[in-house]
């Protein structure tokens, strides 16, 4: 009872429980390797609690250390397809502000059709995360095959 | 101030720290693609704090957003074996109640012998998670090669 | 009773928010399969808040359940290279104290050049985690390709 009462003074976001899980909306136009994401309960099981989307890219609203995770599966893919179209690479990084631009996580598909990874990284309010998929294969838009999320872990 | 005081009355589980890490017990009978899990300190480093096992499947006891993670390694496997037996696919989903049935996470092995991934997803009390392995290869029961877990992240 | 009250006065580490993210420093001498890690803001985006490094290996300072994650990418690697040099295997385990020695997480590269995984595991103060890479290929030292971290989740 008192636990619940205590929470009443502060919304969850003020406890630092920022979290988001996104599903793929679309890929960019040619020459734009970025993946464009969407999230919200109307779309299924994706959500944003704290972070926001800015033109399909995830913007951080609270300073802290975050767990960033991603899975991307290539559409209509076999190991032969994947090796033939090598290098197909996914990179997650801070793309703005430009002064903080850096690659956080990078994976190549080689002979596989799915990459999945996660890492802890400090992020600051206003950081925008971009996910760049280079290569000539399309990512699957199935929500159980391609997703991207962050979870605030500590200040 | 009141948040910290409130914590004094309540056990850990009431803080929403539900967490479980499971090891493979056995595969299902033919035509049942589900993996059957087990957990508890007597078994090694697996445990359940909050969630429960129901006939080898993981049942959630607290509403919230969870980080779900899994690694499955195929037994006596080489890249040749894996490609020869393609498609071997692992899917994690809510299998009951039927009204909430959905695939949360899906991966194919292609030419690899291990898949590993993780994602954030909302789960509700009573949701049962099933892990379906389709194909003709056996999963390794080594506890450092095959495991499945959830961690409550926020309400 | 006093723990909750004490939290009001104490720094973050006392809340159990131990966390570390490390980057590869170097490989061991011949016959030593261990990877040697480094961390700290001067090195980039790696950090240690609670855990410490002991001769390049990660030592835990607080009992609890931890999320352990790792990604290792092989240097100058193609799927041909990876399959040719199979088995190349990464294992994360408790290497000291000897009485608690155990493998926690194990992955082979097969035809891929990157492995990435994560798991929940109980760790105790004083546990040292080692990451052993067996095989004849070098791990990439790029900070977005090879990293290792832990996050305290609950007591």
């Amino acid at each position: 009872q008192r636990f619940a009462q205590a929470q009443q003074q502060l919304p969850l976001e003020s406890l630092g429980w920022d979290v988001a899980e996104l599903q793929l909306n679309h890929t960019g136009p040619q020459q734009d390797p970025r993946l464009y994401w969407q999230g919200g309960p109307a779309l299924g099981r994706s959500f944003l609690h704290g972070p926001e989307l800015d033109k399909g890219q995830l913007r951080i609203h609270r300073d802290g250390i975050y767990m960033v995770h991603i899975q991307v599966t290539l559409a209509i893919c076999s190991s032969t397809t994947a090796s033939r179209h090598h290098p197909t690479t996914l990179a997650v990084g801070i793309c703005s502000p430009a002064s903080r631009s850096i690659s956080l996580l990078r994976l190549s598909f080689h002979q596989g059709c799915t990459i999945a990874s996660q890492r802890l990284t400090p992020l600051a309010r206003g950081d925008t995360l971009c996910t760049n998929l280079t290569g000539t294969l399309l990512p699957s838009r199935n929500t159980d095959e391609t997703f991207f999320g962050v979870q605030w872990v500590r200040p | 101030q009141r948040f910290a005081q409130a914590q004094q009355q309540l056990p850990l589980e009431s803080l929403g720290w539900d967490v479980a890490e499971l090891q493979l017990n056995h595969t299902g009978p033919q035509q049942d693609p589900r993996l059957y899990w087990q957990g508890g300190p007597a078994l090694g480093r697996s445990f359940l704090h909050g969630p429960e096992l129901d006939k080898g499947q993981l049942r959630i006891h607290r509403d919230g957003i969870y980080m779900v993670h899994i690694q499955v390694t195929l037994a006596i496997c080489s890249s040749t074996t894996a490609s020869r037996h393609h498609p071997t696919t692992l899917a994690v989903g809510i299998c009951s109640p039927a009204s909430r049935s959905i695939s949360l996470l899906r991966l194919s092995f292609h030419q690899g012998c291990t898949i590993a991934s993780q994602r954030l997803t909302p789960l509700a009390r009573g949701d049962t998670l099933c892990t379906n392995l389709t194909g003709t290869l056996l999963p390794s029961r080594n506890t450092d090669e095959t495991f499945f877990g959830v961690q409550w992240v926020r309400p | 009773q006093r723990f909750a009250q004490a939290q009001q006065q104490l720094p973050l580490e006392s809340l159990g928010w131990d966390v570390a993210e490390l980057q590869l420093n170097h490989t061991g001498p011949q016959q030593d399969p261990r990877l040697y890690w480094q961390g700290g803001p001067a090195l980039g985006r790696s950090f240690l808040h609670g855990p410490e490094l002991d001769k390049g290996q990660l030592r835990i300072h607080r009992d609890g359940i931890y999320m352990v994650h790792i990604q290792v990418t092989l240097a100058i690697c193609s799927s041909t290279t990876a399959s040719r040099h199979h088995p190349t295997t990464l294992a994360v385990g408790i290497c000291s104290p000897a009485s608690r020695s155990i493998s926690l997480l194990r992955l082979s590269f097969h035809q891929g050049c990157t492995i990435a995984s994560q798991r929940l595991t109980p760790l105790a103060r004083g546990d040292t985690l080692c990451t052993n890479l067996t095989g004849t290929l070098l791990p990439s030292r790029n900070t977005d390709e090879t990293f290792f971290g832990v996050q305290w989740v609950r007591p």
Epitope: - | - | L24, Q30, T73, A75, I76, T80, R84, H85, T136, L137, L138, S140, R141, N142, T143, E145
Partner: antibody, heavy 120, light 111 residues
């Protein structure tokens, strides 16, 4: 410690072929690329190619335009380099070489060298 | 192919003095956080001997007066105090990609 022992010196006519052997001690033969490097008299070092004995896969320097063939016999831990259509400028010392630990193309272990003289 | 260019072609240094040999690659030989540049010593009638690998790692058994440095395209082999037995030809070599290539060699003599 790995030792690489090569076959003896050869004198060959232009247009003929030569086959040089390299026997490796130790049990790591299948796990490391075996490289071949040549050195013409008073000249520098030139990489010719490599074979991965475990699978028989090869990589060649395109400068040799298909004249080099690398093979390996796992049962005897022996690698072979055959050079065809010999000409006078192929007169050189031919070395086999490999790495000691990491299987990248830098060379800890070298054979003693085999002098091949091409002369009419 | 990556072209490796050593300078100077020959070098005469007094015993006990420092000797420096440079090697420039026609493109970067760095990848994955390493510089794939190596140095060898060759004496007459002998195969080359590995001194330095991955730009700055001293091979086991090599005296610590030998050291390597550099990254990207420019690398240096340094002998801090020349000894009589160091008279030889020195080669740089990259292994960033196939084919690996060697520098033309630098002949080191005693002044």
């Amino acid at each position: 410690e790995v030792q690489l022992v090569q076959s003896g010196a050869e004198v060959k006519k232009p247009g003929s072929s030569v086959k040089v052997s390299c026997k490796a001690s130790g049990d790591t033969f299948p796990r490391y690329n075996m490289h071949w490097v040549r050195q013409a008299p008073g000249q520098g070092l030139e990489w010719m190619g490599a074979i991965f004995p475990g699978t028989g896969e090869t990589s060649y320097n395109q400068n040799f335009k298909g004249r080099v063939t690398l093979t390996a016999d796992k049962s005897t831990s022996t690698a072979y380099m055959e050079l065809s259509s010999l000409r006078s400028e192929d007169t050189a010392v031919y070395y086999c070489a490999r790495n000691s630990y990491y299987d990248y193309a830098w060379f800890t272990y070298w054979g003693q060298g085999t002098l091949v003289t091409v002369s009419s | 192919d990556i072209v490796m260019t050593q300078s100077p072609d020959s070098l005469a240094v007094s015993l006990g003095e420092r000797a420096t040999i440079n090697c420039r690659a026609s493109k970067s030989v760095s990848s994955s956080g390493y510089s794939f540049m190596h140095w060898y010593q060759q004496k007459p009638g002998q195969p080359p001997k590995l001194l330095i690998y991955l730009a700055d790692n001293l091979e086991s058994g090599v005296p610590d007066r030998f050291s390597g440095s550099g990254s990207g395209t420019d690398f240096t082999l340094t002998i801090s105090s020349l000894q009589a037995e160091d008279v030889a030809v020195y080669y740089c070599q990259h292994s960033r990609e196939f084919p690996p290539t060697f520098g033309q060699g630098t002949k080191l003599e005693i002044k």
